[in-house]
């Protein structure tokens, strides 16, 4: 999947853009908004009717090296009595993010952008029957 | 910084941490196996905390289109299909990395940017705050 070229709606002098070898692009990995705070409601992973746990995956050849993944705790959803209701399903909600992958080929190092699917949390859904034709 | 295990036969001059600026291939590798978007495409409607998806478009960013979730109700949908206000629909937010064109409008020069997106909603028991 190639990154699309910028739209022709802009007029840009070529000399103001850094020179880049063909088939590649320049990427500054100093993150913009690095220190922004997530203001998500408190403990939603425990208070949800489809609760989840977090695990941290670590890969030194990935930037960022740490990616947090959620896993639904139950197959069903927690009802008002605190029991697991299996007429409903806890399902993962997922979001794609970008990471930079470092690859070693012999003594040379190359970098590749990668799309990674992160499980963010879980939601409770009503299952649907598959009707055989 | 991040330390990398390396071939011991390689010269040791290279920085073991990720450099501030890297040249990357224009092709993006997709690691997303074991997923099928068709399966989860209707969660926003079938959830007890349903949400609407709003398109956020920015040509200076990759991906240029990001879908933002907005919970449809304050409460959650009960077994009768009614909104139950004893429970709350809340957004699940996630920080993701995107590419920002830098300098602006340049076709092959980017900087990583962290953005906060609402991915979907979940139904939670509200916390009762007792005033001392």
């Amino acid at each position: 999947r190639k990154i699309p070229k910028v739209g022709h709606t802009f007029f840009q002098k070529p000399e103001s853009c850094p020179p880049v070898p063909g088939g590649s692009m320049k990427l500054d990995i100093g993150i913009i908004n690095e220190n922004q705070r997530v203001s998500m409601s408190r403990n939603i992973e425990s208070r949800s009717t489809s609760p989840w746990n977090y695990t941290v995956t670590w890969d030194p050849n990935r930037y960022p090296s740490e990616v947090v993944q959620a896993q639904c705790r139950n197959l069903g959803c927690i009802n008002a009595q605190g029991k697991e209701d299996i007429s409903m399903n806890s399902v993962p909600i997922q979001q794609e993010t970008l990471v930079v992958r470092r690859k070693h080929q012999g003594c040379s190092v190359s970098f590749q952008l990668e799309k990674v699917l992160v499980t963010v949390g879980c939601t409770c859904v009503t299952p649907v029957i598959h009707h055989v034709q | 910084g991040i330390t990398i295990p390396r071939n011991p036969g390689c010269p040791n001059s290279e920085d073991k941490n990720f450099p501030r600026t890297v040249m990357v291939n224009l092709n993006i590798h997709n690691r997303n196996t074991n997923t099928n978007p068709k399966r989860s495409s209707d969660y926003y409607n079938r959830s007890t905390s349903p949400w609407n998806l709003h398109r956020n478009e920015d040509p200076e960013r990759y991906p240029s289109v990001i879908w933002e979730a907005k919970c449809r109700h304050l409460g959650c949908i009960n077994a009768d299909g009614n909104v139950d206000y004893h429970m709350n629909s809340v957004p699940i937010q996630q920080e993701i990395l995107v590419l920002r064109r830098e300098p602006p409008h340049c076709p092959n020069s980017f900087r990583l940017e962290k953005i906060l997106v609402s991915v979907g909603c979940t139904c939670v028991t509200p916390i009762v705050h007792h005033v001392a």
Epitope: K83, E84, I86, P127, H130 | N34, T35, K38, R39
Partner: antibody, heavy 123, light 107 residues
Framework: EVQLVESGGGLVQPGRSLRLSCAAS????????MHWVRQAPGKGLEWVSG????????GYADSVKGRFTISRDNAKNSLYLQMNSLRAEDTALYYC????????????????WGQGTTVTVSS | EIVLTQSPATLSLSPGERATLSCRAS??????LAWYQQKPGQAPRLLIY???NRATGIPARFSGSGSGTDFTLTISSLEPEDFAVYYC?????????FGQGTKLEIK
């Protein structure tokens, strides 16, 4: 024809292990959650374990939790049950069954069943 | 866990008669109850799901009713192939559980 065929049963001593397999055909295997259900000789049905389409959600009956492991290989259209630390009370006919829910989720009602494979735990 | 109690344990009837099988849950299972038929030496077969919906290919003489804790499987006019063991199963609370079965035998 929609079909499930179990294999791997047999006579085993208490404390030993056994691996059951279930080969699916005639339907899109990775579109459905799958289950193992057992039936002790002359007794009723007992749900043992279930697994969703991509192995992301798995559940076990309390009687087998920590001893049995359910898994699937969608490329091979196969479902498995690894049974460790077997006990006399695990003696049963083990059925592989397909869930009726769409999207590989759980409905916990089962519309296609295999003919079963017999597991006997005895010294 | 939810206990399902089926009655009677054995029901003796003749072909052409009406059969009424009962399943009672130890607590409400709403309408999340299924019925299965099992003939000797065969695998179970799904008849009814969600208390009253017939599964694909199930004849109209089979019908299910009830909600909450009390459920009934009715076979309007018994055919020779209907003599079997019938199980109810709930999918309301964890874990899914089955009743002990009702044996429908020829009188």
């Amino acid at each position: 024809e929609v079909q499930l065929v179990e294999s791997g049963g047999g006579l085993v001593q208490p404390g030993r292990s056994l691996r059951l397999s279930c080969a699916a055909s005639g339907f899109t295997f990775d579109d459905f959650a799958m289950h193992w259900v057992r039936q002790a000789p002359g007794k009723g049905l007992e749900w043992v374990s279930g697994i969703n389409w991509n192995s992301g959600s798995i559940g076990y009956a309390d009687s087998v939790k920590g001893r049995f492991t359910i898994s699937r290989d969608n490329a091979k259209n196969s479902l498995y049950l690894q049974m460790n630390s077997l006990r006399a009370e695990d003696t049963a006919l083990y059925y592989c069954a397909k869930d009726i829910a769409a999207a590989g989720e759980f409905y916990f009602d089962m519309d296609v069943w295999g003919q079963g494979t017999t597991v006997t735990v005895s010294s | 866990e939810i206990v399902l109690t089926q009655s009677p344990a054995t029901l003796s009837l003749s072909p052409g008669e009406r059969a009424t099988l009962s399943c009672r849950a130890s607590q409400s299972v709403s309408s999340y109850l299924a019925w299965y038929q099992q003939k000797p030496g065969q695998a179970p077969r799904l008849l009814i799901y969600d208390a009253s919906n017939r599964a694909t290919g199930i004849p109209a003489r089979f019908s299910g009713s009830g909600s909450g804790t009390d459920f009934t499987l009715t076979i309007s006019s018994l055919e020779p192939e209907d003599f079997a063991v019938y199980y109810c199963q709930q999918r309301s609370n964890w874990p899914p559980t089955f009743g002990q079965g009702t044996k429908l035998e020829i009188k």
